[in-house]
């Protein structure tokens, strides 16, 4: 696994412990919390990052209307179970034996149950809608410049293949970035849209996962873009399975008539 040889750190994941104990004295980095060896030439999976985070000390509309099956991560942080490849296990349980099924980005897609709950497969999140509101700026953003800059960001910083950035919508002050990646489209070595979205989410919260870099400085023709709020919608290849109770107001949170809750990331 590649890492910076000189000081043996992981450029793409600061939540690691690195040492020159790889083959031939090469630098090898392991994710905090899980001890899994990570590839520092690409993004670390969201599952391993969440696990590391939990182990760390605490401190005329042109915009897209989210599909009725869109999920939003309303449950917040949890300590996930990851498979040997670093993917989320389809079934997640907490210490009190409450279990639920998740999608490939680790967001709950069923009601909570007990240990008898079955999650047959890990359902892929194939469409992610990142909804941002930017802070007022002295100079206006041109849509095509903004589009180009965001595509460049996902390509260069998150190493996401350009074909997976489906669209960038802009209706001041709202920006929407659509990421799409079907199972059949994702080749070996391709960054997962869920991982790219998670790195981006942490960046816009001022919690960069990259080693030793300052915060993300995003500019459009020199004009800085500052994000005031972020909301991320996840759409799965198979719609989520929630009981009617949740849809008719019995569930927690807002937006009870849709298969999502509005969860604001500040």
């Amino acid at each position: 696994h590649t890492a910076a040889q000189d000081n043996c750190t992981c450029p793409t994941n600061k939540m690691t412990v690195c040492s020159p104990d790889g083959p031939g004295g090469r630098c090898q980095c392991r994710a905090l919390g899980s001890g899994v060896a990570v590839d520092c030439s690409t993004l670390t999976s969201k599952c391993l990052l969440l696990k590391a985070r939990m182990s760390a000390p605490k401190n005329a509309r042109t915009l897209v209307r989210p599909n009725e099956h869109a999920l939003v991560d309303n449950d917040g942080l949890y300590d996930p179970d990851c498979d040997p490849e670093g993917r989320f296990k389809a079934r997640q349980c907490n210490q009190t034996s409450v279990c639920w099924c998740v999608n490939s980005v680790g967001v709950r897609r069923t009601d909570k149950g007990d240990l008898s709950l079955r999650c047959d497969e890990l359902v892929r999140t194939h469409h992610i809608l990142i909804d941002l509101r930017h802070r007022p700026t002295a100079g206006a953003f041109n849509h095509s410049d903004l589009d180009a800059e965001l595509r460049r960001l996902f390509r260069e910083r998150y190493r996401l293949h350009p074909k997976f950035v489906a669209a960038v919508h802009y209706e001041q002050p709202t920006i929407q970035i659509e990421l799409r990646q079907n199972t059949s489209q994702k080749a070996a070595g391709d960054v997962d849209i869920g991982d790219a979205a998670y790195y981006f989410e942490r960046d816009v919260k001022g919690e960069s996962l990259f080693q030793g870099r300052g915060g993300l400085d995003l500019r459009v023709r020199g004009e800085p873009l500052q994000v005031e709020r972020t909301l991320i919608y996840y759409l799965d290849e198979i719609p989520p399975k929630f009981s009617m109770k949740r849809l008719t107001g019995g569930g927690s949170g807002g937006g009870s008539h849709h298969h999502h809750h509005h969860h604001h990331h500040h």
Partner: antibody
Framework: QVQLVQSGAEVKKPGASVKVSCKAS????????INWVRQRPGQGLEWMGW????????KYAQKFQGRVTMTVDTSTSTVYMELSSLRSEDTAVYYC???????????????WGQGTLVTVSS | EIVLTQSPATLSLSPGERATLSCSAS?????IYWYQRKPGQAPRLLIY???NLASGIPARFSGSGSGTDYTLTISSLEPEDFAVYYC?????????FGQGTKVEIK
């Protein structure tokens, strides 16, 4: 540490041009914009414009449009501000200042160069 | 253009006293930036994004406000705090500064 060092004082005749340099060090030069601000004797601070070294984008104050030109030399991490058609009212101390920003915050103008006194006199 | 009006123009206080400087904008702005300038020196950033202390600035300085009214407070004046203070907006072009408030020793 981040530092901006400006060229020395200049004395110019009315109608002439002046070119002030600002050399940056201690940070990735292309990662923030360089602003120019002047202070005339006994007056307040007046923003003239900025240039973004990464792509050469620039924004000038309307008041100076047509008279000011900001350029960048990335090989030497230097920004230049040229003011033409000088008049006596342009006598001032000219400052360069960098502005760092992230998606979370705009960190203001910090630090500033030491200032360059430009005197316009016949 | 947005005009920033600072008051008072001059503030005469003694070391140890509390200084309250005001900055009023001609139209609503989202954030204000505060700078200190001493004779023969370049301005120094004190506060960014209305209330955040710039690097290396003592905690006796604080900023607050919203809309059109903003305040810089120095909780207990030190001898080195006697200077001219400027507010600045980044809401619309041209970027503008207030005319300054001079804090002098009484």
């Amino acid at each position: 540490q981040v530092q901006l060092v400006q060229s020395g004082a200049e004395v110019k005749k009315p109608g002439a041009s002046v070119k002030v340099s600002c050399k940056a060090s201690g940070y990735t030069f292309t990662s923030s914009d360089i602003n120019w601000v002047r202070q005339r004797p006994g007056q307040g601070l007046e923003w003239m414009g900025w240039i973004y070294p990464r792509d050469g984008s620039k924004k000038y104050a309307q008041k100076f449009q047509g008279r000011v030109t900001m350029t960048v030399d990335t090989s030497t991490s230097t920004v230049y501000m040229e003011l033409s058609s000088l008049r006596s009212e342009d006598t001032a101390v000219y400052y360069c200042a960098t502005r760092f920003a992230t998606v979370v915050s705009n960190y203001g103008l910090d630090p500033w160069g030491q200032g360059t006194l430009v005197t316009v006199s016949s | 253009e947005i005009v920033l009006t600072q008051s008072p123009a001059t503030l005469s206080l003694s070391p140890g006293e509390r200084a309250t400087l005001s900055c009023s904008a001609s139209s609503s702005v989202n954030y204000i930036y505060w700078y200190q300038r001493k004779p023969g020196q370049a301005p120094r950033l004190l506060i960014y994004d209305t209330s955040n202390l710039a690097s290396g600035i003592p905690a006796r300085f604080s900023g607050s406000g919203s809309g059109t009214d903003y305040t810089l407070t120095i909780s207990s004046l030190e001898p080195e705090d006697f200077a001219v203070y400027y507010c600045q907006q980044w809401n619309s072009y041209p970027l503008t500064f207030g005319q300054g408030t001079k804090v002098e020793i009484k």
